[in-house]
Interface confidence: medium
Amino acid sequence: EVEKTACPSGKKAPEIDESLIFYKKWELEACVDAALLATQMDRVNAIPFTYEQLDVLKHKLDELYPQGYPESVIQHLGYLFLKMSPEDIRKWNVTSLETLKALLEVNKGHEMSPQVATLIDRFVKGRGQLDKDTLDTLTAFYPGYLCSLSPEELSSVPPSSIWAVRPQDLDTCDPRQLDVLYPKARLAFQNMNGSEYFVKIQSFLGGAPTEDLKALSQQNVSMDLATFMKLRTDAVLPLTVAEVQKLLGPHVEGLKAEERHRPVRDWILRQRQDDLDTLGLGLQG
């Protein structure tokens, strides 16, 4: 912590500018007005302050705003955001999507840091739900964001937000997460026609129950094997050979290559050999 010392004559900073890089730590503490710093935060990033000088500037902001920074300051933190601890961020009330974007921009290209995770948590909790615009923004910066949420957190995602989800956003989701997301997707896309509906719902099908898979098998959807392999085993087991054949269409031949892997393996063991033989793939039950 920097000691409180009087500012030397003529060194009081009239504005935040490059001349301050020549100030010692104690001079910055004594000669830079915290309120001035807060109003001119947008200048800080373009001045080559040393890490130690930035520590002093952060300390001044912390003293000025012990209950947490106002959004007007947060929005202009730039890479000083990287110096904030999760504890600092928990004091913030970030409501503007523009502020969120500005700070995510700082961390862009890097894995999600504890600071970013805390910021997102605060923002989403403040909004009460994960609305479409927020989800759009978060998945643009972190494609794996959705799958990092617990099933409980996912339950606050309104069906309308599902329109913002891209297939790659679900790549790392486990079955428990898809169980929560699938009914929302089904609701969101319910007014679409058959082929369009399947394109949209496909990446959520890892949460689909048996009856929905049976219904899809009646719609000539030609599900690919990659999607089939992600279906819930308990949802696949009750399907008949005829239903799986209709569900997969021309992709049914791919079952042979996957016969040793779940859910195909378990499904094969549940079928009568006579029925499997109708596929002509040499599958052994």
Epitope: E18, I21, N45, A46, I47, P48, T50, Y51, E52, D55, G78, Y79, L82, K83, E105, V106, K108, G109, H110, S113
Partner: antibody
Framework: QVQLQQPGAELVKPGASVKLSCKAS????????MHWVKQRPGQGLEWIGM????????NYNEKFKSKATLTVDKSSSTAYMQLSSLTSEDSAVYYC?????????WGTGTTVTVSS | QIVLTQSPAIMSASPGEKVTMTCSAS?????MYWYQQKPGSSPRLLIY???NLASGVPVRFSGSGSGTSYSLTISRMEAEDAATYYC?????????FGAGTKLELK
Amino acid sequence: QVQLQQPGAELVKPGASVKLSCKASGYTFTIYWMHWVKQRPGQGLEWIGMIHPNSGNTNYNEKFKSKATLTVDKSSSTAYMQLSSLTSEDSAVYYCSLIHWYFDVWGTGTTVTVSS
Amino acid sequence: QIVLTQSPAIMSASPGEKVTMTCSASSSVSYMYWYQQKPGSSPRLLIYDTSNLASGVPVRFSGSGSGTSYSLTISRMEAEDAATYYCQQWSSYPLTFGAGTKLELK
């Protein structure tokens, strides 16, 4: 992911100048200071200076002030370093890098050889 | 400018052995940063703010120190740790690096 692309090598004659490039991708180019670092064969690392792509502000190591000039082209997310009046002492690998608290990204380096 | 002196200049260690190298600053600094560099590769950040591990760095690496005296420790040497290690300060300009400690596998 964040990447800094640099050409592999430059062969230049004594007394000439060379302009090294560093193309950035995977992050917002205008946010971070871009640093340049020199490494002579078998030697340690020397900091040359840094430039802020958005403002064009620079901060040089006094030792390199008359040797290096840092610039950026925001439209192509590319940083440049011009080295002038080259001598054999300038033969080295030159790295561009982002150096920040908990992360760093370095270019692969450009090997400059000064030879007649 | 702040001069950083690293010692030893060269050292060797056997797999599983504990390794400690030091970095002494000519005047006090608040933080030290440590980089690892292997032949033909760019440097890589290991430790930031004196003691924090950068992303993806194995937990066998640790940093400590304050003022003018800092150190980097590898709790159990592994073959892949053979490299040159540099300390770096950003307390005042120009940024400076130590001359490096070359760690060889015994």
